[in-house]
Amino acid sequence: HTVELNNMFGQIQSPGYPDSYPSDSEVTWNITVPDGFRIKLYFMHFNLESSYLCEYDYVKVETEDQVLATFCGRETTDTEQTPGQEVVLSPGSFMSITFRSDFSNEERFTGFDAHYMAVDVDECKEREDEELSCDHYCHNYIGGYYCSCRFGYILHTDNRTCRVECSDNLFTQRTGVITSPDFPNPYPKSSECLYTIELEEGFMVNLQFEDIFDIEDHPEVPCPYDYIKIKVGPKVLGPFCGEKAPEPISTQSHSVLILFHSDNSGENRGWRLSYRAAGNECPELQPPVHGKIEPSQAKYFFKDQVLVSCDTGYKVLKDNVEMDTFQIECLKDGTWSNKIPTCKIVDCRAPGELEHGLITFSTRNNLTTYKSEIKYSCQEPYYKMLNNNTGIYTCSAQGVWMNKVLGRSLPTCLPECGQPSRSLPSLVKRIIGGRNAEPGLFPWQALIVVEDTSRVPNDKWFGSGALLSASWILTAAHVLRSQRRDTTVIPVSKEHVTVYLGLHDVRDKSGAVNSSAARVVLHPDFNIQNYNHDIALVQLQEPVPLGPHVMPVCLPRLEPEGPAPHMLGLVAGWGISNPNVTVDEIISSGTRTLSDVLQYVKLPVVPHAECKTSYESRSGNYSVTENMFCAGYYEGGKDTCLGDSGGAFVIFDDLSQRWVVQGLVSWGGPEECGSKQVYGVYTKVSNYVDWVWEQMGLPQSVVEPQVER
């Protein structure tokens, strides 16, 4: 009879065990365990009748189609085998054990005691069949196994082979290389690869297989396993396989599909191809005169671009438009997108006008083309070029006039300072005790007229100032302070200020230049109580033209000592010139006993200590600060007076051979102007040079050469 066993383990014994088994008996045990397991069988006791080749009694172990072992007897001999310590393993999940005894037993035989168990199959070690083994990685577990793939691969639906996702490859460059996945390593199995070459219309794709070509094939059937097919429009080329690469293919199309198919077996290295776009050829190009074409090639095809540029000093001219370069392109119909332009010499055109300057052409016919040369010069003697620039400009390749130092910037013509058109006489008489100034003697002298219409009644006064540049006047702060009913320092409105330059006789202003004020700047620390920091600036609405009667004075170097004692300076003004009229009379009566013609006087600088002492001895709050110096004579007789305020006290600088403004008429008193031991007090300009330049918005270096050259 047959016994079916389905457990994972169990015991099998001969009939009647442990007693002797009966004669003429046959029992079959069919053991079935789940897939992924095999059956292990071993005997703990075995005692059967011996016979040649186990003809009488035996235990036979078999599978569906194979006898695994036949056992009998008690011990193994040449012709019979007992299991002993041997273990019988089924190759699969089924094992059949048959026990048979013949009709007679000479002795009592106790039979057998066997045990079985299901044991795991390690499929990863034991699968040798390529059709069944994992493509990349195998993972065993009790009762089964599974496969996995290397990075970049996907497990096929057969759960065994590893394929790649390669159906979405787009190539748009004009040249490129396409290979089978993992080339030159074997390509993946079970894969469908699609490569699309999509170029701009007008190009044609040429294909060439290179290096190794190794695709699984078959000796009789054309490419049944793995293959390449090339699809051009409706036409399909291929399939291709084997070890011989196809010849180069000219597709005559801008769009190509490459299909690569691999089945689930085989180890082949794959393929590599390069593709190249071909286009229509364009005619040969000739570079323009004075120009070149880049890149320079023997042949040009569709989509090739060339850049036309010109030699240094020439510009590309296309349709009357100048440019640095011009690009043309080979079109799909084999023509160029444009004609070759011409190269035209660069023209810097007419040079910019120089304020207070002239231009002379160094090149014949007043040429303004590349490498032409011009020279700027300033209107001498009233202006000179800043930093002694050469003024030479060359027409550059960029089409701009260039100077070696200034680049494309124009030079600056700075007003010459401190050089009157007439030389001042050495003999100077007595503004009290002064004399008439000849026109052009003090070309920096400015008359400042203030008419304050915001006051009731309207207030009108005047003072002097000194021209520093074409746009700026230096004067005393108290001249431009609103004549208020308190001691607050508020500047007069610029609308109330008029400046006269080149004026000689106040009765005849026709020859003078009159200008409105754009800005009135008082020194921020001007103190009405003691006239400390009595300095101010007026910016003119428009720059004034310089000439023999209108020229600036030079600013001094920054030196706290100021002018040396006993140095002689000149000061001019239209102030009170009559020594017999008192200041109080003028203030109270409103009479203007002023000079019509500009007066000037020569005065020595008084030692600071002497001046301080002279004022400290007086009643009233008179302080001579370090921002002031005094000038005049102990015996009096010569002095500046009311109305001369803000005028320049100038000293001739031997080093620069120029007149420098060292002082500004500030104050004096309380006795009358020109009184004995009443020195005129002047603002020490050298203490304010930085402040002046800052207000004028110019760096100090601009002026240094004027005074120190």
Epitope: S454, V456, R485, D486, T487, S493, I528, Q529, N621, P670
Partner: antibody, heavy 114, light 112 residues
């Protein structure tokens, strides 16, 4: 013609602040200063401070410099005087004046009472 | 700080008579550079803002009757109404503008 028009009367509690305005017209606001003066009932004139609209310079009577703030808004030609930490003795008529006291506002009565 | 002291505190004058008010400063108001005395005189009538009469000690403001005159220099100043009119009844203040501003305590002028 020149006019200075001040804001209306105010009643404030001790410790509070008051801000009086003074709107100028008829002249260029930035060319002259604005002065503030006050007068307690039955008392004399007391100068508070001064502001110059062109550059916002200010000057104060030492007595008020910690409590008074003078400002201007040149876009509306208006000057302001703010007095903080009010006490009963700040009850007064507050005047603004311009063009060096040639023109005065009508005065603003500020009453400080609990 | 400059202190301004007016005298008398009040003054009763007959119509057409001269009225004189004095003002003394604690320091000189004469500015040596500008040669001006920074002193002003104001008139204030009840319920009205003050009115400027005199500045720089002696300069009459535009539109002020010439019966009003100012004098003095340094520290001592005087306002004179040469012939008192009914409309001149008011409180008169002096003010220094030499260093910031300070008012005198005021002088009340009445008709006798």
């Amino acid at each position: 013609q020149v006019q200075l028009v001040q804001s209306g009367a105010e009643v404030k509690k001790p410790g509070a602040s008051v801000k009086v305005s003074c709107k100028a017209s008829g002249y260029t606001f930035t060319t002259d200063d604005i002065n503030w003066v006050r007068q307690a009932p039955g008392q004399g004139l007391e100068w508070i401070g001064w502001i110059y609209p062109r550059d916002d310079r200010t000057k104060y009577n030492d007595k008020f410099k910690d409590r008074a703030t003078l400002t201007v808004d040149t876009s509306s030609n208006t000057a302001y005087m703010e007095l903080s930490s009010l006490r009963s003795e700040d009850t007064a008529v507050y005047y603004c004046s311009s063009l060096e006291d040639t023109y005065w506002g009508q005065g603003t009565l500020v009453t400080v009472s609990s | 700080d400059i202190v301004m002291t007016q005298s008398p505190d009040s003054l009763a004058v007959s119509l057409g008579e001269r009225a004189t008010i004095n003002c003394k400063s604690s320091q000189s108001l004469l500015q040596s550079r500008t040669r001006k005395n920074y002193l002003a005189w104001y008139q204030q009538k009840p319920g009205q803002p003050p009115k400027l009469l005199i500045y720089w000690a002696s300069t009459r403001e535009s539109g002020v009757p010439d019966r009003f005159s100012g004098s003095g220099s340094g520290t001592d100043f005087t306002l004179t109404i040469s012939s008192l009119q009914a409309e001149d009844v008011a409180v008169y203040y002096c003010k220094q503008s030499y260093n910031l501003y300070t008012f005198g305590q005021g002088t009340k002028v009445e008709i006798k």
